[in-house]
Each structure stands twice: as structure tokens, then as C-alpha cells.
């Protein structure tokens, strides 16, 4: 059998092979030793034995899409049946206390490969012997550690494949500078050790995306907006704009990158290197948000100009796969640099939103009945922008961070938006005060330090008195500029 | 839709050169490789060579190694064959045609265009 | 490189007859093998691709078959529309190399 037969449903064309040159991959034209690893198709009745307690899945990902060019990383996890782990020596243990189908296990090992492998003959005295190899016979590596692997992956893809001996985890890179652009297949067999052969125990298969456009994702955030996730956002307040580069190789560490904004309320196209940009819409409705981003990259070079016409001579027939016999343009020079562009777009639509919320005054309620513990205070608070529809006061502690009481409800407001909220503290002390005024679209929110004084039955007698006038003054009340701090924190990434 | 227009006819004399072209669009045009394609009057179809418009990577016929260029402009995602030093037996209709992917067969095909070369 | 040899040269089949046509190559080329419908005057026309899988749009009366060297497209009832050249084409190694054609016509 050759690889293909075993790794793949169909066999690769050499067309596809010599237009996406692996470094460092094989052709799967190679012959698989079936003595050494032999082949099941799906549905073999030997799979269900393949692993003691259960099936292994394997869990291939990738960091796709990558930009061509740039490495893409391809990761294999093991997942084992309940109760199964890797330990330190590379065997599978059961773990401690843990009770699968068939109850605590008595051995505490489900495959005791160490055991195995000291007690192995046949060597050389290299370490190496007939069954220390891959599937197309190349010999184990030998790392530190390496008869702590277990594991034989090969991945294939491409009409190439390339094997690694592994642990539960094995990560394999892959530079994409001669891959086709589009969407490709990664399949993934894992074979275990198993006396001096291997078994399957795996099949995996993923698809990945090499493209020449910049992956580019871009988060909308603005102070108050309710929702930044459905694209809605307010009137006259800044949406800050976070571009994200999808770029897990640092491909684009090295380039000069600019973003190009259009906005779509005809105030023109705005060119940054930053990737983060402030935009205030001043107009409600419906605008078409375009993002252009250019890197200048390692890329492809020019092939030279062609030599002048020179009568034909007879030439060499075709030579294997990269002896490059059809004229194959020269390999690019790695100093060569090439424009890379990304595309954002998106529609968003701009409404009317609370703006501004601010308390004006505290003012202590008089009880005619003074509780022992409990006091009243009212927030006259203004706010700006859109009425709102619901009031939040959340109470807490002076670090803001502790709530003790936290209460929401709705309010009817008139157009110069007054309101006043009334309150209950348990107790004296100093209170953080977070209140929240909310529409469907926006929430605006204004924190406030409050002290409460203790309560004996003369001030409060005396305060009675004197009805009720400037009792803002007993408080010491001071808005902080909390609130701000932590907004801008929390929005700029 | 996928469309391939390529430039119209042409009349040459032995020993001149011919450059035809082939717009593409309706796709990303970096993403394909395009071939080249022939047909003598008659005959069968022959293929000629074929471009990477990403990376301008080509590869030629043999029999046609040193008498034909493939380029790109990828500003106006166009692909051009140059031909060079023809004879009659060139006279042909020229068609330039999109791979699929890793697949070197042709979904798509540019309507032709047909060179004559006589003096 | 590799020789394509398509028979026959020329095919007349009876209106919905089956109409068979072989394509040989001179090494192996399997899957990879495409058929192709042309009619004067216009390009080829893709009909089938990797030897067996019908490309979209074609009717189900054309079907591909074959592997290893010797493959088949079969129209398993002939209507006047396929009147038509028939070319093979290897996509399995460049250079690209096509089969010679069979002209298929109305008996």
C-alpha cells in the first residue's frame, strides 16, 4: 500500500503535489509499511478493540486562516475515555478515585508502555531497532525523552504527508508560501505503540484556509450603548473601533500597517497606523462602515523578464516532481516585499441614546418616625440624550466593589428629564452609589460616594424643625469620576 | 459568475509575435491558476501552459518553451500569452481556462480567440 | 509525458441508444481524469471530473468510469444535444495532455 491508500479517499494528483511544495513533507506516492502499522477501513470490527475501556477521539484544530506566506499551525489532542490520562513516562493511567462503567480499577494502568519497552530485546545498543520507525521506515528521532512517546501521527494533506512521534499533544507548523489559496483538508491518523507494532486508534480530519487577504476582525464598543454586539449604537457619543489582525505566526510583525476608515457619513476617508479609532456619528440612521488594511509583507518577487526569443533547442524530458523541467519561474527571493490588504466591512445603525446621566443633589428624607437603622435618601438626577425608561441603583461598598442591595425599576419622565430616586440605606457608614438610567438602546450610568451620619433622635428632630431646607448640607457627597476610569478601561482592549 | 473574455482576433505574419489577453472576473483572481489552451482548426485541443496570477509561478509545454510568455496585471485581473516567432501551423484558436483549486480541470473556459498567421 | 489514446475516432448511435467511449492512458493516472463536450464554434464544456463525479449542471445520462489506465464515459441514452466532439483530458500531471476526441453523431 502506499500512503494515500491509507491516509486518503482518493489518491492526489502529482498536479497537486508540484503546485504545493511542503518543506520538509513526502510524497504519499511512498509505500506504507502495513506489517509494522496496519490499515482499517471505517467500520472494521477491530477499531472497538483498538483501545482498552472505550475509543480515543483526536482533536485536530488549526489557527486557519493564515495568510499566505505565514506558518499555519495545525494541534492534535488525544481525548481518552473516562477515567484515562497521560502521566509523566508517557503512560496511560487511570486516574485516583475516579469511577467509570466498569468501576475502580485495580491496575492502576491502562497502558504501561515503560514496563514494556525496558523490558524490550533486539536492540542495537542505539536505541534503535526494526520497529523504531515511521510507517515509511525513517527512524524514530532520537530527542531526550523520546521513549516517553507513545503516539505516531500522520498528517497528510495536499497530496504530501508528514509523520511525528508524540505524546497526547502533538503540534505540527506548516509554511503556506506554496500553497494554492483556499480551502484544504488536513486528515490525521494516530496510531499507539502496541509490543513492537502499532495499532490505530484515530481519525481526524479538519479543513483549513490559506488566503491572500488579511484577516481582519474589528470590535465596535461606545460608552452607554446597551448592546455592542447588534451593530446599534448612539447619536453623538464615540464608537471606538479596535482592529484585531488574525496573524498567530507574527507573519506581519515586521510590516508598516495602515488602516483606511470610511465611515459612510461622508466625512471622508480617515488614514491611521493605529489600530484603534474614535468615531462620533452626529446623524441617526443607517451607515455603511468600510475598513481597508494594507501591510506591506514578505511576498512573492516579479518573475524576471523574459530573455529575449532564441530559436528552440531540443530540452530534457520531464524530470521528477521539482526538478522544476516546465519552466517553473524562479523561487522567490525572501527580501521581497508585497502589499497585503484586508477587508472589513459593516452596516451599523446610529439612534438616539442617553448621553449623560448626573445626580445633582442628595437630600436626607425626614421620618416622622425615625427607624433605628434604616435611612432614606432621595437622587435628584438629570440626564441628557434620549428618556429613559428604567432606573438601577445598585448600593455597595465604598470600593464600589461589594453590593449590597441592588434595585431596578421602571420611571416615567418628562422631556427635561428631572427625576428624582429615593433610596434606603441600612445604617450609617459610606456607601458607593452606582445609578443606571436605561432605553432599549443605551444605559447611562453616574456613580456617586455617599456618607451616611449616624442618626440620634435630636438631629433628626432638629432637622424636622427646620423643614426640611438645604439637608444636602448634612451629607458629604461627593460625585467621583469613578465611573469614567473604569468605562475607558473596560472599552479600550 | 465566473466569466473569462478574452481579446478578439488576430492576423500575423510568420515570424511575428501575438499577445492575447483574457479578463477575468466574478472571482478572487490570485486564487486560480489559468492555462492556456489550443485548437488548430480541425484538431484537437493542446495544452500550452499555465500562470499563478498570485505569484506569477508558470509552467510551460515543452513544445512551446522559449516561444511563449504568460503574464498577469493583476490591477485589472487580466492574464496575457505571448507567442512568439509563429508559423502557420500556429493558426488556431487560443482559449485561456481556470483550474479548480488543486484541480487541473477546467469549469471554465474564455470564449477563444482565433489567430491566423499567414503572409 | 503521458499519451492519451481515445476510441473510437467517430461514434453513431441511434437516438436513445448508449453511446460508450474509452480513454487510455499510457501510465497511471487514476483519479484524475476529466471528459469534456465541445460543439463547433464554442469551447470545451466540462462534463465529468476525477474520472466518476458529474459536474454541475450536466444531465445524468453522462457518467464517467475507470481507473488505473482505461476509463470510460458512458451517455446511457443519446438525445440530439450531445451531438458533439469528446475529449479526455489527464489532470494528474503536467503537462496536460488530452485524448485525440470522438466525434459522436446521429445514426
Known amino acids: 500500500k502506499r500512503f494515500h491508500d491509507v491516509l486518503g479517499n482518493e489518491r492526489p494528483s502529482a498536479y497537486m503535489r508540484e503546485h504545493n511544495q511542503l518543506n520538509g513533507w513526502s510524497s504519499d506516492e511512498n509505500d506504507w509499511n502495513e506489517k509494522l502499522y496496519p490499515v482499517w477501513k471505517r467500520g472494521d470490527m477491530r477499531w472497538k478493540n483498538s483501545w482498552k475501556g472505550g475509543r480515543v477521539q483526536a482533536v485536530l484544530t488549526s489557527d486557519s486562516p493564515a495568510l499566505v506566506g505565514s506558518n499555519i499551525t495545525f494541534v492534535v489532542n488525544l481525548v481518552f475515555p473516562r477515567c484515562q490520562k497521560e502521566d509523566a513516562n508517557g503512560n496511560i493511567v487511570y486516574e485516583k478515585n475516579c469511577r467509570n462503567e466498569a468501576g475502580l480499577s485495580a491496575d492502576p494502568y491502562v497502558y504501561n508502555w515503560t514496563a514494556w519497552s525496558e523490558d524490550s530485546d533486539g536492540e542495537n545498543g542505539t536505541g534503535q531497532s526494526h520497529h523504531n520507525v515511521f510507517p515509511d521506515g525513517k527512524p524514530f528521532p532520537h530527542h531526550p525523552g523520546w521513549r516517553r512517546w507513545n503516539f505516531v501521527y500522520v498528517f497528510h494533506t495536499l497530496g504530501q504527508y508528514f509523520q511525528k512521534l508524540g505524546r497526547c499533544s502533538v503540534r505540527v507548523s506548516v509554511n503556506t508560501a506554496n500553497v494554492t489559496l483556499g480551502p484544504q483538508l488536513m486528515e490525521v491518523t494516530v496510531y499507539r505503540r502496541h509490543g513492537r507494532a502499532y495499532v490505530p486508534i484515530a481519525q481526524v480530519k479538519d479543513v483549513y484556509v490559506v488566503t491572500d487577504q488579511i484577516p481582519v476582525f474589528v470590535t465596535m464598543s461606545q460608552k452607554n450603548d446597551r448592546n455592542s454586539s447588534d451593530e446599534t449604537f448612539l447619536k453623538d457619543l464615540p464608537i471606538t473601533f479596535d482592529v484585531l489582525i488574525h496573524d498567530p505566526s507574527h507573519f506581519l510583525n515586521y510590516s508598516t500597517i495602515n488602516y483606511k476608515w470610511s465611515f459612510g457619513d461622508n466625512t471622508g476617508l480617515f488614514v491611521s497606523i493605529n489600530h484603534t479609532v474614535n468615531h462620533t456619528y452626529v446623524l441617526n440612521g443607517t451607515f455603511s462602515l468600510n475598513l481597508t488594511v494594507k501591510a506591506a509583507a514578505p511576498g512573492p518577487c516579479p518573475p524576471p523578464p523574459p530573455p529575449p526569443p532564441r530559436p528552440p533547442k531540443p530540452t530534457p524530458s520531464l524530470g521528477p516532481a521539482g526538478d522544476n523541467p516546465l519552466g517553473l519561474s524562479e523561487i522567490p527571493d525572501e527580501n521581497c516585499q508585497i502589499n497585503r490588504y484586508g477587508h472589513f466591512q459593516a452596516t451599523i445603525t446610529i439612534v438616539e441614546g442617553i448621553l449623560e446621566v448626573n445626580i445633582i443633589q442628595t437630600t436626607d428624607v425626614l421620618m416622622l418616625v425615625p427607624g433605628p437603622d434604616s435611612s432614606l435618601i432621595d437622587f435628584v438626577v438629570t440626564c441628557q440624550g434620549s428618556i429613559p425608561t428604567e432606573v438601577c441603583t445598585i448600593i455597595s461598598d465604598p470600593t464600589c466593589e461589594i453590593t449590597q442591595n441592588a434595585v431596578c425599576s421602571p420611571v416615567d419622565v418628562d422631556e427635561m428629564c428631572l427625576l428624582t430616586v429615593r433610596r434606603a440605606f441600612n445604617g450609617s457608614g459610606t456607601y458607593c452609589v452606582n445609578l443606571t438610567l436605561g432605553d432599549d438602546t443605551s444605559l447611562a450610568l453616574t456613580s456617586t460616594l455617599i456618607s451616611v451620619p449616624d442618626r440620634d433622635p435630636a438631629s433628626s428632630l432638629r432637622m424636622a424643625n427646620s423643614g426640611g431646607g438645604g439637608l444636602n448640607d448634612i451629607f458629604e457627597a461627593q460625585k467621583i469620576e469613578w465611573h469614567e476610569h473604569h468605562h475607558h478601561h473596560h472599552h479600550h482592549h | 459568475q465566473v466569466q473569462l473574455v478574452q481579446s478578439g482576433a488576430e492576423v500575423k505574419k510568420p515570424g511575428a509575435s501575438v499577445k492575447v489577453s483574457c479578463k477575468a472576473s466574478g472571482y478572487t483572481f490570485t486564487s486560480y491558476w489559468m492555462h492556456w489552451v489550443r485548437q488548430a482548426p480541425g484538431q484537437g485541443l493542446e495544452w500550452m501552459g499555465e500562470?499563478?496570477?498570485?505569484?506569477?509561478?508558470?509552467n510551460y509545454a515543452q513544445k512551446f518553451q522559449g516561444r511563449v510568455t504568460m503574464t498577469v496585471d493583476k490591477s485589472t485581473s487580466t492574464v496575457y500569452m505571448e507567442l512568439s516567432s509563429l508559423r502557420s501551423e500556429d493558426t488556431a484558436v487560443y482559449y485561456c481556462?481556470?483550474?479548480?483549486?488543486?484541480?487541473?480541470?477546467?469549469?471554465?473556459w474564455g470564449q477563444g480567440t482565433l489567430v491566423t498567421v499567414s503572409s | 509525458d503521458i499519451v492519451m489514446t481515445q476510441s473510437p475516432d467517430s461514434l453513431a448511435v441511434s437516438l436513445g441508444e448508449r453511446a460508450t467511449i474509452n480513454c487510455k492512458t499510457s501510465?497511471?493516472?487514476?483519479?484524475?481524469l476529466a471528459w469534456y463536450q465541445q460543439k463547433p464554434g464554442q469551447p470545451p464544456k466540462l462534463l465529468i471530473y476525477?474520472?466518476?463525479y458529474r459536474y454541475t449542471g450536466v444531465p445524468d445520462r453522462f457518467s464517467g468510469s475507470g481507473s488505473g489506465t482505461d476509463f470510460t464515459l458512458t451517455i446511457s441514452s443519446l438525445q440530439a444535444e450531445d451531438v458533439a466532439v469528446y475529449y479526455c483530458?489527464?489532470?494528474?500531471?503536467?503537462?496536460?495532455?488530452f485524448g485525440g476526441g470522438t466525434k459522436v453523431e446521429i445514426k
Open positions: 483530458q489527464q489532470h494528474y500531471s503536467i503537462p496536460l495532455q
Open positions: 476525477s474520472a466518476r
Open positions: 500562470i499563478n496570477p498570485y505569484d506569477q509561478r508558470t
Open positions: 481556462a481556470r483550474s479548480t483549486g488543486n484541480y487541473a480541470w477546467f469549469a471554465y
Open positions: 501510465q497511471d493516472v487514476s483519479p484524475s
